[in-house]
Interface confidence: low
Protein backbone atom coordinates (compact mmCIF):
# COMPACT_ATOMS: atom_id res chain seq x y z
CA UNK A 1 0.00 0.00 0.00
CA UNK A 2 1.93 3.03 -1.31
CA UNK A 3 -0.14 5.50 0.70
CA UNK A 4 1.81 4.43 3.75
CA UNK A 5 4.80 6.54 2.61
CA UNK A 6 4.65 10.17 3.77
CA UNK A 7 7.30 12.68 2.58
CA UNK A 8 8.00 16.32 3.43
CA UNK A 9 10.51 18.45 1.51
CA UNK A 10 10.60 21.64 -0.62
CA UNK A 11 8.86 21.08 -3.95
CA UNK A 12 11.64 22.74 -5.98
CA UNK A 13 15.22 23.59 -5.09
CA UNK A 14 17.32 26.20 -6.85
CA UNK A 15 21.08 26.43 -7.35
CA UNK A 16 23.67 27.36 -9.95
CA UNK A 17 26.63 25.71 -11.62
CA UNK A 18 29.42 24.98 -9.13
CA UNK A 19 27.36 25.70 -6.01
CA UNK A 20 25.67 22.98 -3.98
CA UNK A 21 22.20 21.76 -3.09
CA UNK A 22 21.05 20.80 0.35
CA UNK A 23 17.71 19.00 0.23
CA UNK A 24 15.98 18.83 3.63
CA UNK A 25 13.73 15.80 3.62
CA UNK A 26 11.75 13.65 6.07
CA UNK A 27 9.75 10.49 5.43
CA UNK A 28 7.73 7.83 7.17
CA UNK A 29 7.45 4.23 5.99
CA UNK A 30 4.84 2.67 8.20
CA UNK A 31 5.80 -0.92 7.57
CA UNK A 32 9.37 -0.86 8.80
CA UNK A 33 12.89 0.35 8.13
CA UNK A 34 14.39 1.37 4.81
CA UNK A 35 16.38 -1.38 3.16
CA UNK A 36 17.32 0.17 -0.17
CA UNK A 37 17.70 3.75 -1.42
CA UNK A 38 18.51 4.85 -4.97
CA UNK A 39 18.68 8.49 -6.13
CA UNK A 40 17.77 8.80 -9.81
CA UNK A 41 18.13 11.74 -12.13
CA UNK A 42 15.06 12.07 -14.41
CA UNK A 43 13.70 8.59 -13.66
CA UNK A 44 11.31 6.94 -16.12
CA UNK A 45 9.28 3.85 -15.38
CA UNK A 46 9.94 0.95 -17.70
CA UNK A 47 6.77 -1.13 -18.04
CA UNK A 48 8.65 -4.05 -19.56
CA UNK A 49 11.02 -4.48 -16.65
CA UNK A 50 8.71 -2.94 -14.02
CA UNK A 51 11.70 -0.92 -12.92
CA UNK A 52 12.85 2.70 -13.18
CA UNK A 53 15.44 3.72 -15.76
CA UNK A 54 17.62 6.84 -15.42
CA UNK A 55 20.98 8.04 -14.19
CA UNK A 56 21.72 6.69 -10.76
CA UNK A 57 23.32 9.46 -8.74
CA UNK A 58 23.46 7.48 -5.53
CA UNK A 59 22.76 3.91 -4.48
CA UNK A 60 22.63 2.45 -1.01
CA UNK A 61 21.47 -1.13 -0.68
CA UNK A 62 21.76 -3.88 1.89
CA UNK A 63 25.14 -4.64 0.34
CA UNK A 64 26.22 -1.03 1.04
CA UNK A 65 27.21 -0.27 -2.56
CA UNK A 66 27.77 3.38 -3.50
CA UNK A 67 28.70 4.45 -7.06
CA UNK A 68 32.30 5.56 -6.67
CA UNK A 69 32.01 8.37 -9.22
CA UNK A 70 29.17 10.01 -7.30
CA UNK A 71 31.04 11.12 -4.21
CA UNK A 72 29.54 14.59 -4.74
CA UNK A 73 26.12 13.14 -3.83
CA UNK A 74 25.51 12.27 -0.20
CA UNK A 75 22.51 10.67 1.43
CA UNK A 76 22.45 12.13 4.91
CA UNK A 77 19.34 10.30 6.01
CA UNK A 78 18.54 7.22 8.03
CA UNK A 79 16.40 4.09 7.83
CA UNK A 80 13.09 5.46 9.11
CA UNK A 81 12.82 9.28 9.28
CA UNK A 82 15.43 11.40 7.52
CA UNK A 83 15.95 11.51 3.75
CA UNK A 84 18.13 14.66 3.55
CA UNK A 85 20.44 14.86 0.52
CA UNK A 86 23.43 16.95 -0.47
CA UNK A 87 24.91 17.46 -3.94
CA UNK A 88 28.23 19.30 -3.93
CA UNK A 89 29.17 20.63 -6.37
CA UNK A 90 25.99 20.77 -8.39
CA UNK A 91 26.10 21.01 -12.18
CA UNK A 92 23.88 22.49 -14.85
CA UNK A 93 22.96 19.05 -16.15
CA UNK A 94 21.67 18.06 -12.69
CA UNK A 95 18.60 20.17 -13.49
CA UNK A 96 15.40 18.19 -13.76
CA UNK A 97 13.76 15.64 -11.54
CA UNK A 98 15.42 13.83 -8.70
CA UNK A 99 13.77 10.51 -7.92
CA UNK A 100 14.14 9.01 -4.45
CA UNK A 101 13.49 5.30 -4.88
CA UNK A 102 12.79 3.90 -1.43
CA UNK A 103 12.29 0.24 -0.62
CA UNK A 104 11.43 -1.41 2.68
CA UNK A 105 10.90 -5.10 3.28
CA UNK A 106 7.46 -5.12 1.64
CA UNK A 107 6.87 -1.68 0.10
CA UNK A 108 8.34 0.53 -2.64
CA UNK A 109 7.99 4.26 -3.30
CA UNK A 110 9.31 6.82 -5.80
CA UNK A 111 9.37 10.38 -4.47
CA UNK A 112 10.12 13.21 -6.92
CA UNK A 113 11.85 16.51 -6.16
CA UNK A 114 12.46 19.25 -8.75
CA UNK A 115 15.96 20.67 -9.13
CA UNK A 116 16.56 23.89 -11.05
CA UNK A 117 20.25 24.62 -11.70
CA UNK A 118 21.10 27.79 -13.63
CA UNK A 119 24.26 28.53 -15.55
CA UNK A 120 25.08 31.60 -13.45
CA UNK A 121 24.10 32.70 -9.94
CA UNK A 122 20.50 33.91 -10.15
CA UNK A 123 19.64 37.29 -8.63
CA UNK A 124 18.01 37.82 -5.25
CA UNK A 125 14.69 39.64 -5.07
CA UNK A 126 14.20 42.95 -3.23
CA UNK A 127 10.84 43.37 -1.52
CA UNK A 128 9.69 46.89 -0.60
CA UNK A 129 6.67 48.00 1.43
CA UNK A 130 3.78 49.26 -0.75
CA UNK A 131 4.48 52.88 0.23
CA UNK A 132 7.58 54.58 1.60
CA UNK A 133 7.33 57.96 3.33
CA UNK A 134 10.18 60.22 4.38
CA UNK A 135 11.45 59.73 7.94
CA UNK A 136 9.25 56.67 8.50
CA UNK A 137 11.25 53.53 9.22
CA UNK A 138 10.73 50.74 6.70
CA UNK A 139 12.16 47.26 6.33
CA UNK A 140 13.81 46.39 3.03
CA UNK A 141 13.91 42.66 2.38
CA UNK A 142 16.26 40.82 0.03
CA UNK A 143 15.28 37.21 -0.59
CA UNK A 144 17.28 34.50 -2.36
CA UNK A 145 15.80 31.04 -2.89
CA UNK A 146 19.07 29.36 -2.06
CA UNK A 147 20.97 28.13 0.97
CA UNK A 148 23.49 25.34 1.28
CA UNK A 149 25.78 24.33 4.12
CA UNK A 150 28.66 23.71 1.77
CA UNK A 151 28.52 27.04 -0.06
CA UNK A 152 28.49 30.16 2.18
CA UNK A 153 27.10 33.33 0.61
CA UNK A 154 26.36 36.88 1.78
CA UNK A 155 23.84 39.54 0.81
CA UNK A 156 25.02 43.16 0.85
CA UNK A 157 22.94 46.33 0.55
CA UNK A 158 24.12 49.28 -1.54
CA UNK A 159 22.66 52.74 -2.02
CA UNK A 160 23.76 54.33 -5.30
CA UNK A 161 26.59 51.80 -5.37
CA UNK A 162 27.84 52.62 -1.86
CA UNK A 163 27.43 50.07 0.98
CA UNK A 164 24.64 51.11 3.33
CA UNK A 165 25.74 51.85 6.91
CA UNK A 166 22.61 50.44 8.53
CA UNK A 167 23.05 46.98 10.06
CA UNK A 168 21.28 44.25 8.11
CA UNK A 169 19.97 41.07 9.70
CA UNK A 170 20.62 37.95 7.61
CA UNK A 171 18.73 34.72 8.22
CA UNK A 172 18.74 31.36 6.49
CA UNK A 173 16.17 28.62 6.26
CA UNK A 174 17.02 25.00 5.44
CA UNK A 175 13.81 23.28 6.42
CA UNK A 176 11.44 20.83 4.80
CA UNK A 177 9.09 23.80 4.19
CA UNK A 178 11.52 26.25 2.57
CA UNK A 179 15.11 26.91 1.59
CA UNK A 180 16.21 30.53 1.38
CA UNK A 181 18.63 33.23 2.51
CA UNK A 182 17.09 36.52 3.57
CA UNK A 183 18.55 39.89 4.50
CA UNK A 184 16.43 42.55 6.23
CA UNK A 185 17.49 46.16 6.53
CA UNK A 186 15.72 48.74 8.70
CA UNK A 187 16.01 52.10 7.00
CA UNK A 188 14.57 55.58 7.58
CA UNK A 189 14.56 57.17 4.13
CA UNK A 190 14.85 60.92 3.72
CA UNK A 191 13.26 62.87 0.89
CA UNK A 192 16.64 63.04 -0.83
CA UNK A 193 16.59 59.23 -1.21
CA UNK A 194 13.69 59.56 -3.65
CA UNK A 195 14.69 58.20 -7.05
CA UNK A 196 17.90 56.68 -5.71
CA UNK A 197 18.90 53.13 -6.62
CA UNK A 198 19.05 50.46 -3.91
CA UNK A 199 20.91 47.25 -4.72
CA UNK A 200 21.00 43.90 -2.97
CA UNK A 201 24.19 42.16 -4.02
CA UNK A 202 24.81 38.45 -3.76
CA UNK A 203 28.44 37.68 -2.95
CA UNK A 204 30.39 34.53 -2.20
CA UNK A 205 32.26 34.05 1.10
CA UNK A 206 35.21 36.09 -0.23
CA UNK A 207 33.00 39.03 -1.19
CA UNK A 208 33.16 38.24 -4.92
CA UNK A 209 30.16 39.52 -6.87
CA UNK A 210 27.74 36.82 -8.02
CA UNK A 211 24.50 38.65 -8.92
CA UNK A 212 22.23 41.49 -7.79
CA UNK A 213 18.77 43.03 -7.83
CA UNK A 214 18.06 46.76 -7.95
CA UNK A 215 15.04 48.97 -7.22
CA UNK A 216 14.43 52.68 -7.55
CA UNK A 217 13.15 54.18 -4.30
CA UNK A 218 9.84 56.01 -4.48
CA UNK A 219 9.90 58.07 -1.28
CA UNK A 220 6.72 60.06 -0.71
CA UNK A 221 7.51 63.43 0.84
CA UNK A 222 6.14 66.90 1.40
CA UNK A 223 7.32 69.58 -1.03
CA UNK A 224 10.85 70.87 -0.38
CA UNK A 225 11.10 74.57 -1.01
CA UNK A 226 13.57 77.36 -1.56
CA UNK A 227 12.63 81.01 -1.12
CA UNK A 228 14.43 83.76 -2.99
CA UNK A 229 13.94 87.47 -2.36
CA UNK A 230 14.81 90.61 -4.29
CA UNK A 231 16.59 92.54 -2.87
CA UNK A 232 18.56 89.64 -1.48
CA UNK A 233 19.11 91.15 1.99
CA UNK A 234 15.33 91.76 2.37
CA UNK A 235 15.96 95.29 3.64
CA UNK A 236 13.93 97.98 1.85
CA UNK A 237 12.60 101.45 2.44
CA UNK A 238 8.96 102.43 2.63
CA UNK A 239 7.61 102.78 -0.91
CA UNK A 240 10.01 100.26 -2.43
CA UNK A 241 8.95 96.99 -4.11
CA UNK A 242 9.84 93.47 -2.97
CA UNK A 243 9.60 90.21 -4.95
CA UNK A 244 9.70 86.79 -3.30
CA UNK A 245 9.91 83.62 -5.37
CA UNK A 246 9.13 80.14 -4.13
CA UNK A 247 10.89 77.24 -5.85
CA UNK A 248 9.95 73.59 -5.42
CA UNK A 249 13.16 71.58 -5.38
CA UNK A 250 11.35 68.30 -4.81
CA UNK A 251 7.84 66.98 -4.32
CA UNK A 252 6.44 63.45 -4.39
CA UNK A 253 3.66 63.20 -5.33
CA UNK A 254 3.20 66.37 -7.36
CA UNK A 255 2.34 69.57 -5.54
CA UNK A 256 -1.21 70.91 -5.69
CA UNK A 257 -1.44 74.23 -3.82
CA UNK A 258 0.76 77.23 -3.11
CA UNK A 259 0.28 79.85 -0.40
CA UNK A 260 2.28 82.55 1.36
CA UNK A 261 2.43 83.22 5.09
CA UNK A 262 3.43 86.32 7.03
CA UNK A 263 4.25 85.81 10.69
CA UNK A 264 2.56 82.40 10.49
CA UNK A 265 -0.72 83.73 9.02
CA UNK A 266 -1.83 82.96 5.48
CA UNK A 267 -1.93 85.91 3.06
CA UNK A 268 -5.21 86.05 1.16
CA UNK A 269 -5.26 85.70 -2.64
CA UNK A 270 -1.54 84.89 -2.77
CA UNK A 271 -1.40 81.45 -4.38
CA UNK A 272 1.25 81.65 -7.06
CA UNK A 273 4.96 80.99 -6.86
CA UNK A 274 5.74 84.71 -6.86
CA UNK A 275 4.80 87.22 -4.16
CA UNK A 276 4.99 90.82 -5.35
CA UNK A 277 4.84 93.52 -2.67
CA UNK A 278 4.58 96.96 -4.25
CA UNK A 279 5.11 100.25 -2.38
CA UNK A 280 5.68 98.50 0.92
CA UNK A 281 4.77 100.08 4.22
CA UNK A 282 6.37 99.50 7.60
CA UNK A 283 3.41 97.28 8.57
CA UNK A 284 4.60 94.77 5.98
CA UNK A 285 7.78 94.10 7.94
CA UNK A 286 7.83 90.55 9.28
CA UNK A 287 8.69 86.91 8.62
CA UNK A 288 7.56 85.55 5.26
CA UNK A 289 7.56 82.00 3.97
CA UNK A 290 5.87 80.02 1.23
CA UNK A 291 3.88 76.85 1.80
CA UNK A 292 3.30 74.26 -0.89
CA UNK A 293 1.17 71.18 -0.29
CA UNK A 294 0.84 67.75 -1.84
CA UNK A 295 -1.03 64.58 -0.81
CA UNK A 296 1.53 63.88 1.93
CA UNK A 297 1.09 67.30 3.51
CA UNK A 298 2.37 70.87 3.47
CA UNK A 299 6.00 71.84 3.06
CA UNK A 300 7.33 75.22 4.20
CA UNK A 301 10.31 77.21 3.06
CA UNK A 302 12.75 78.90 5.40
CA UNK A 303 11.58 82.25 6.68
CA UNK A 304 12.69 85.52 5.14
CA UNK A 305 12.71 88.46 7.55
CA UNK A 306 11.57 91.51 5.60
CA UNK A 307 12.70 94.79 7.14
CA UNK A 308 10.97 97.91 5.89
CA UNK A 309 13.00 100.95 6.91
CA UNK A 310 11.35 104.29 7.70
CA UNK A 311 12.12 107.63 9.31
CA UNK A 312 11.29 108.03 13.02
CA UNK A 313 7.65 108.55 13.96
CA UNK A 314 6.62 111.43 16.27
CA UNK A 315 8.32 110.81 19.58
CA UNK A 316 6.96 110.61 23.10
CA UNK A 317 8.77 111.24 26.36
CA UNK A 318 8.57 109.01 29.40
CA UNK A 319 9.61 110.47 32.77
CA UNK A 320 10.82 108.36 35.68
CA UNK A 321 9.31 109.69 37.97
CA UNK A 322 6.99 112.68 38.03
CA UNK A 323 6.20 114.41 40.28
CA UNK A 324 9.78 114.52 41.53
CA UNK A 325 10.97 115.82 44.89
CA UNK A 326 13.65 118.48 44.84
CA UNK A 327 17.08 116.88 45.17
CA UNK A 328 16.00 113.50 43.79
CA UNK A 329 17.15 112.09 40.46
CA UNK A 330 15.01 111.92 37.30
CA UNK A 331 15.44 110.08 33.99
CA UNK A 332 13.81 111.05 30.70
CA UNK A 333 13.39 108.49 27.87
CA UNK A 334 12.73 109.50 24.25
CA UNK A 335 10.59 106.87 22.49
CA UNK A 336 10.14 106.77 18.73
CA UNK A 337 9.41 103.91 16.34
CA UNK A 338 12.03 103.83 13.60
CA UNK A 339 14.00 101.43 11.42
CA UNK A 340 16.92 101.55 11.61
CA UNK A 341 16.97 102.68 15.23
CA UNK A 342 17.55 106.41 15.76
CA UNK A 343 21.17 107.43 16.04
CA UNK A 344 20.66 110.99 17.28
CA UNK A 345 18.22 112.76 19.60
CA UNK A 346 17.49 116.44 20.20
CA UNK A 347 15.95 117.36 23.56
CA UNK A 348 13.75 120.40 24.37
CA UNK A 349 12.84 121.95 27.71
CA UNK A 350 9.85 124.30 27.51
CA UNK A 351 10.39 124.50 23.74
CA UNK A 352 14.06 125.44 24.02
CA UNK A 353 16.79 123.07 22.79
CA UNK A 354 18.86 121.48 25.55
CA UNK A 355 22.45 121.79 24.33
CA UNK A 356 24.72 118.71 24.43
CA UNK A 357 21.87 116.26 24.98
CA UNK A 358 21.90 113.78 22.03
CA UNK A 359 21.21 110.45 23.72
CA UNK A 360 18.02 108.44 24.00
CA UNK A 361 18.07 108.97 27.77
CA UNK A 362 18.66 112.15 29.74
CA UNK A 363 19.60 111.75 33.38
CA UNK A 364 19.39 114.62 35.91
CA UNK A 365 21.04 113.47 39.14
CA UNK A 366 19.70 116.32 41.35
CA UNK A 367 16.42 117.97 40.48
CA UNK A 368 15.92 121.66 41.20
CA UNK A 369 12.65 123.63 41.06
CA UNK A 370 13.60 125.32 37.78
CA UNK A 371 13.83 121.85 36.10
CA UNK A 372 10.03 121.72 36.13
CA UNK A 373 8.25 122.11 32.79
CA UNK A 374 7.57 120.38 29.48
CA UNK A 375 10.13 118.02 28.02
CA UNK A 376 10.01 116.89 24.37
CA UNK A 377 12.42 115.29 21.92
CA UNK A 378 13.09 114.61 18.24
CA UNK A 379 14.61 111.33 16.97
CA UNK A 380 16.75 111.05 13.85
CA UNK A 381 17.98 108.09 11.72
CA UNK A 382 19.60 107.73 8.30
CA UNK A 383 16.21 108.18 6.60
CA UNK A 384 15.31 111.43 8.25
CA UNK A 385 14.20 113.33 11.34
CA UNK A 386 10.96 112.62 13.13
CA UNK A 387 8.50 115.15 14.45
CA UNK A 388 8.48 116.48 17.97
CA UNK A 389 5.70 114.89 19.98
CA UNK A 390 3.51 116.58 22.60
CA UNK A 391 6.10 116.12 25.34
CA UNK A 392 5.68 115.26 29.01
CA UNK A 393 5.31 117.46 32.08
CA UNK A 394 7.79 117.31 34.98
CA UNK A 395 6.37 118.50 38.27
CA UNK A 396 8.97 119.35 40.96
CA UNK A 397 7.87 119.38 44.57
CA UNK A 398 9.88 121.45 47.06
CA UNK A 399 9.49 122.92 50.55
CA UNK A 400 8.50 126.57 51.06
CA UNK A 401 11.21 129.11 50.19
CA UNK A 402 11.80 132.63 51.68
CA UNK A 403 8.92 132.47 54.09
CA UNK A 404 7.64 135.95 54.92
CA UNK A 405 5.12 136.78 57.55
CA UNK A 406 2.41 139.27 56.86
Amino acid sequence: DSSKWVFEHPETLYAWEGACVWIPCTYRALDGDLESFILFHNPEYNKNTSKFDGTRLYESTKDGKVPSEQKRVQFLGDKNKNCTLSIHPVHLNDSGQLGLRMESKTEKWMERIHLNVSERPFPPHIQLPPEIQESQEVTLTCLLNFSCYGYPIQLQWLLEGVPMRQAAVTSTSLTIKSVFTRSELKFSPQWSHHGKIVTCQLQDADGKFLSNDTVQLNVKHTPKLEIKVTPSDAIVREGDSVTMTCEVSSSNPEYTTVSWLKDGTSLKKQNTFTLNLREVTKDQSGKYCCQVSNDVGPGRSEEVFLQVQYAPEPSTVQILHSPAVEGSQVEFLCMSLANPLPTNYTWYHNGKEMQGRTEEKVHIPKILPWHAGTYSCVAENILGTGQRGPGAELDVQYPPKKVTTV
Epitope: H194, G195, Q216, E226, E247, V248, S249, S250, S251, N252, P253, E254, Y255, T256, F273, N294
Partner: nanobody, 121 residues
Framework: QVQLVESGGGLVQAGDSLKLSCLAS????????MSWFRQAPGKEREFVAG????????HHADSVKGRFTISRDNAKSAVYLQMNSLQPEDTAVYFC??????????????WGQGTQVTVSS
Amino acid sequence: QVQLVESGGGLVQAGDSLKLSCLASGITFSSYYMSWFRQAPGKEREFVAGVGRSGAPSHHADSVKGRFTISRDNAKSAVYLQMNSLQPEDTAVYFCAAKWMAASTTVADYWGQGTQVTVSS
Protein backbone atom coordinates in the same frame (compact mmCIF):
# COMPACT_ATOMS: atom_id res chain seq x y z
CA GLN B 1 19.46 55.29 -24.48
CA VAL B 2 17.16 58.06 -23.28
CA GLN B 3 16.03 60.60 -25.86
CA LEU B 4 13.72 63.61 -25.59
CA VAL B 5 13.00 65.18 -28.98
CA GLU B 6 11.20 68.54 -29.17
CA SER B 7 9.41 69.84 -32.26
CA GLY B 8 6.92 72.55 -33.24
CA GLY B 9 9.04 75.66 -32.75
CA GLY B 10 9.30 78.42 -35.34
CA LEU B 11 8.87 82.10 -36.19
CA VAL B 12 5.43 83.63 -35.49
CA GLN B 13 3.81 87.04 -35.11
CA ALA B 14 2.80 88.47 -31.74
CA GLY B 15 -0.64 87.17 -30.78
CA ASP B 16 -0.23 83.92 -32.75
CA SER B 17 -0.28 80.35 -31.36
CA LEU B 18 2.16 77.43 -31.49
CA LYS B 19 2.05 73.88 -30.15
CA LEU B 20 5.30 72.28 -29.05
CA SER B 21 5.65 68.49 -28.82
CA CYS B 22 8.21 66.36 -27.03
CA LEU B 23 8.55 62.64 -27.75
CA ALA B 24 10.35 60.50 -25.18
CA SER B 25 12.06 57.16 -25.70
CA GLY B 26 14.23 54.93 -23.49
CA ILE B 27 12.36 55.75 -20.27
CA THR B 28 9.20 54.50 -18.54
CA PHE B 29 7.41 57.68 -19.52
CA SER B 30 4.52 57.36 -17.05
CA SER B 31 7.00 57.30 -14.13
CA TYR B 32 8.33 60.79 -14.86
CA TYR B 33 7.13 64.30 -14.11
CA MET B 34 7.41 66.16 -17.42
CA SER B 35 8.27 69.84 -17.71
CA TRP B 36 8.93 72.58 -20.21
CA PHE B 37 11.65 75.16 -19.58
CA ARG B 38 12.88 78.04 -21.70
CA GLN B 39 16.06 80.03 -22.05
CA ALA B 40 16.18 83.45 -23.68
CA PRO B 41 19.52 84.80 -24.97
CA GLY B 42 21.70 85.97 -22.10
CA LYS B 43 19.22 84.80 -19.49
CA GLU B 44 18.99 81.83 -17.14
CA ARG B 45 16.89 78.81 -17.97
CA GLU B 46 13.42 79.20 -16.39
CA PHE B 47 10.53 76.90 -15.56
CA VAL B 48 7.51 77.30 -17.85
CA ALA B 49 5.17 74.45 -16.98
CA GLY B 50 5.07 70.96 -15.51
CA VAL B 51 2.60 68.09 -15.50
CA GLY B 52 2.13 65.16 -13.09
CA ARG B 53 2.69 61.54 -14.00
CA SER B 54 -1.01 60.87 -14.57
CA GLY B 55 -1.61 64.14 -16.43
CA ALA B 56 -2.67 66.04 -13.31
CA PRO B 57 -1.99 68.29 -11.62
CA SER B 58 -0.35 70.73 -13.99
CA HIS B 59 1.67 73.77 -12.95
CA HIS B 60 2.42 76.92 -14.93
CA ALA B 61 4.76 79.84 -14.28
CA ASP B 62 2.99 83.10 -13.45
CA SER B 63 4.29 84.69 -16.65
CA VAL B 64 2.46 82.18 -18.90
CA LYS B 65 -0.67 81.42 -16.83
CA GLY B 66 -3.82 81.66 -18.93
CA ARG B 67 -1.84 81.63 -22.19
CA PHE B 68 0.13 78.36 -22.13
CA THR B 69 -1.23 74.89 -21.35
CA ILE B 70 0.83 71.75 -20.71
CA SER B 71 -0.58 68.26 -21.36
CA ARG B 72 0.71 64.73 -21.82
CA ASP B 73 -0.22 61.47 -23.53
CA ASN B 74 1.33 58.49 -21.73
CA ALA B 75 0.28 56.08 -24.48
CA LYS B 76 2.38 58.06 -26.97
CA SER B 77 5.15 58.97 -24.48
CA ALA B 78 4.58 62.59 -25.43
CA VAL B 79 4.22 65.93 -23.67
CA TYR B 80 2.82 69.06 -25.29
CA LEU B 81 2.87 72.81 -24.71
CA GLN B 82 0.04 74.76 -26.31
CA MET B 83 1.14 78.41 -26.51
CA ASN B 84 -1.51 81.07 -27.25
CA SER B 85 -1.28 84.89 -27.39
CA LEU B 86 2.48 84.71 -27.89
CA GLN B 87 4.45 87.85 -27.01
CA PRO B 88 7.96 88.93 -28.12
CA GLU B 89 9.16 88.23 -24.55
CA ASP B 90 8.27 84.55 -25.10
CA THR B 91 11.14 84.31 -27.60
CA ALA B 92 13.49 81.60 -26.33
CA VAL B 93 14.76 78.08 -26.82
CA TYR B 94 12.17 75.74 -25.27
CA PHE B 95 13.42 72.58 -23.58
CA CYS B 96 11.53 69.46 -22.61
CA ALA B 97 12.65 67.81 -19.34
CA ALA B 98 11.89 64.50 -17.62
CA LYS B 99 12.19 64.50 -13.86
CA TRP B 100 11.79 61.72 -11.34
CA MET B 101 10.83 64.39 -8.80
CA ALA B 102 8.14 66.99 -9.35
CA ALA B 103 10.01 70.26 -9.15
CA SER B 104 9.92 73.75 -10.55
CA THR B 105 13.68 74.25 -10.30
CA THR B 106 15.99 73.73 -13.24
CA VAL B 107 17.08 70.28 -12.12
CA ALA B 108 16.11 67.37 -14.35
CA ASP B 109 17.19 63.81 -15.01
CA TYR B 110 16.90 64.10 -18.79
CA TRP B 111 16.82 67.09 -21.15
CA GLY B 112 15.89 67.51 -24.79
CA GLN B 113 18.06 69.48 -27.22
CA GLY B 114 15.53 72.34 -27.42
CA THR B 115 13.40 73.99 -30.10
CA GLN B 116 13.61 77.69 -31.02
CA VAL B 117 10.51 79.87 -30.69
CA THR B 118 10.77 83.41 -32.10
CA VAL B 119 7.93 85.91 -31.73
CA SER B 120 8.21 89.07 -33.78
CA SER B 121 6.25 92.23 -33.08
